[in-house]
Interface confidence: low
């Protein structure tokens, strides 16, 4: 009987990577392409339809367009190899390869896709009043992850984690975690993204810098003090201008000059 074999019935691949799934079929001597039929499907989505020596791209599901191909040179070795590039989370599922060559047979192959929380963005900011540091770690991945904060002396610290959907891909999670702590320069903290799926942890190291500029969140201080200082400045400037020149036009010039010269640097320390 005509029988297909698979060397692996489970493939685990990383998001954005490539995978080649293989079904083997018996070939004696030279392959007759006109007698060969190869179908690759995934949950009713047609991926490959190879009939009469030709691949019919018209039937290919749009989600696999430009990403899935049958490796033609492998057919002559008795392998129906489906290559998927730039693997997406939606590609996970059960694939079916059906081969007809005299007889016919099919096999199922499972594809699992995971996305490690590898590219961890980090930020450190400080409250100039309380000197409390805010440490932030952010990364995208799949499945959901919890974030564990630890210090260099292995203490587990309590952070606040929020999970949203990624803008890049629907199923990808955007995990952001913050830790508020009193810390001194050169102290080291770690944020670890721990997934519930394949056991793979990803950790970022955050080192408290010597000196930090005032973070954007401290704009609130300026919003409260700003109008008062501005009003005081205007009153003083008007008084000065009127005393010196006694003309309205000079008041406008003086005040404008005073306002424009007042600049503020609101920068956060950021590391990626």
């Amino acid at each position: 009987a005509f029988t297909i074999t698979v060397s692996k019935d489970l493939y685990v691949v990383e998001y954005g990577g490539n995978v080649t799934m293989e079904c083997k079929f018996p070939v004696e001597k030279q392959l007759n392409l006109f007698a060969l039929i190869v179908y690759w499907e995934m949950e009713d989505k047609k991926i490959i339809q190879f009939v009469n020596g030709k691949e019919d791209l018209k039937v290919q599901h749009s989600s696999y367009s430009q990403r899935a191909q049958l490796l033609k040179d492998q057919l002559f070795l008795g392998k129906a190899a489906l290559q998927i590039t730039d693997v997406r989370l939606q590609d996970a599922g059960v694939y079916c390869c059906l081969i007809g060559y005299g007889g016919a047979d099919y096999k199922r192959i499972t594809l699992k896709v995971h996305a490690p929380y590898r590219n961890i963005s980090q930020r450190i900011s400080v409250d100039p009043v309380t000197s409390e540091h805010e440490l932030m770690c952010q990364a995208e991945g799949y499945p959901e992850a919890e974030v564990i904060w630890t210090s260099s002396d292995h203490r587990v610290l309590s952070g606040k984690t929020t999970i949203t959907n990624s803008n890049r891909e629907e199923k990808l999670f955007n995990v952001t975690s913050t830790l508020n702590i009193n810390a001194t320069a050169n102290e080291i903290f770690y944020c670890t993204f721990q997934r519930s799926g394949p056991e793979e942890n990803n950790t970022a190291e955050l080192v408290i810098p010597e000196r930090l500029p005032v973070p954007a969140s401290e704009r609130t201080h300026f919003m409260i003090l700003g109008p008062f200082l501005l009003l005081l400045g205007v009153v003083l400037a008007v008084t000065f201008c009127l005393k010196k020149h006694g003309r309205m036009m000079d008041v406008e010039k003086c005040c404008t000059r005073d306002r424009n010269s007042k600049k503020r640097n609101d920068i956060q320390f950021e590391e990626t």
């Epitope: 392959l31 392409l33 006109f34 020596g53 030709k54 490796l71 040179d73 492998q74 290559q83």
Partner: antibody
Framework: EVQLVESGGGLVQPGRSLKLSCAAS????????MAWVRQAPKKGLEWVAS????????YYGDSVKGRFTISRDNAKSTLYLQMNSLRSEDTATYYC?????????????WGQGTLVTVSS | NTVMTQSPTSMFISVGDRVTVNCKAS??????VDWYQQKTGQSPKLLIY???NRYTGVPDRFTGSGSGTDFTLTISNMQAEDLAVYYC?????????FGGGTKLELK
């Protein structure tokens, strides 16, 4: 025995046109992809164009796209290459090639070539 | 376009030598690479298809290997009739592109 015989080459002025032919025999012409490959004097090989067996799909190299047209007449077992707006860099021996199986690549059979010289 | 860089461009060899011709692709082309032999005054001839498959009638001293970006054609026991120019061809990306060729000459 598979045979491919090119014809139609010669001397032509820049900007003019020329049509090459390739007469095929010894196999069922309509079952195979066909291609044109060229070779400038003392230079390497350059793939020019390919055509599928039922004439629905054509593929071109960047240097000839928009100027050359590959076509076939399955009834006459003949492959053609219509070359327009010829340039001096098109000077080459043009080979007609047949795939090993019914794929666009794996050029297993080649003609003897026909020389095209583009010069004023 | 995918650039196929062949090395060396020429080689002086003796009969019986083991000869290695290399081809490097500018991007991943899988195993979609052929090797062709062209003797002086003749049309090219297909030796290897799909990176490692010897075409019908090709002597087994010719071996193709590699995948991704690096490919090799090996002639295990060089014969006088193997003196020719050897070309690699990638057909993974359109336009399909040949390497510049490697000329094998007698020492």
């Amino acid at each position: 025995e598979v045979q491919l015989v090119e014809s139609g080459g010669g001397l032509v002025q820049p900007g003019r046109s020329l049509k090459l032919s390739c007469a095929a025999s010894g196999f069922t012409f309509s079952d195979y992809y066909m291609a044109w490959v060229r070779q400038a004097p003392k230079k390497g090989l350059e793939w020019v164009a390919s055509i599928s067996y039922e004439d629905s799909s054509t593929y071109y190299g960047d240097s000839v796209k928009g100027r050359f047209t590959i076509s076939r007449d399955n009834a006459k077992s003949t492959l053609y290459l219509q070359m327009n707006s010829l340039r001096s860099e098109d000077t080459a021996t043009y080979y007609c090639a047949r795939s090993a199986w019914n794929y666009p690549y794996w050029f297993a059979y080649w003609g003897q070539g026909t020389l095209v010289t583009v010069s004023s | 376009n995918t650039v196929m860089t062949q090395s060396p461009t020429s080689m002086f060899i003796s009969v019986g030598d083991r000869v290695t011709v290399n081809c490097k692709a500018s991007q991943n082309v899988g195993t979609n690479v052929d090797w062709y032999q062209q003797k002086t005054g003749q049309s090219p001839k297909l030796l290897i298809y799909g990176a490692s498959n010897r075409y019908t009638g090709v002597p087994d001293r010719f071996t193709g290997s590699g995948s991704g970006t690096d490919f090799t054609l090996t002639i295990s026991n060089m014969q006088a009739e193997d003196l020719a120019v050897y070309y690699c061809l990638q057909y993974n990306y359109n336009p399909w592109t040949f390497g510049g060729g490697t000329k094998l000459e007698l020492k």
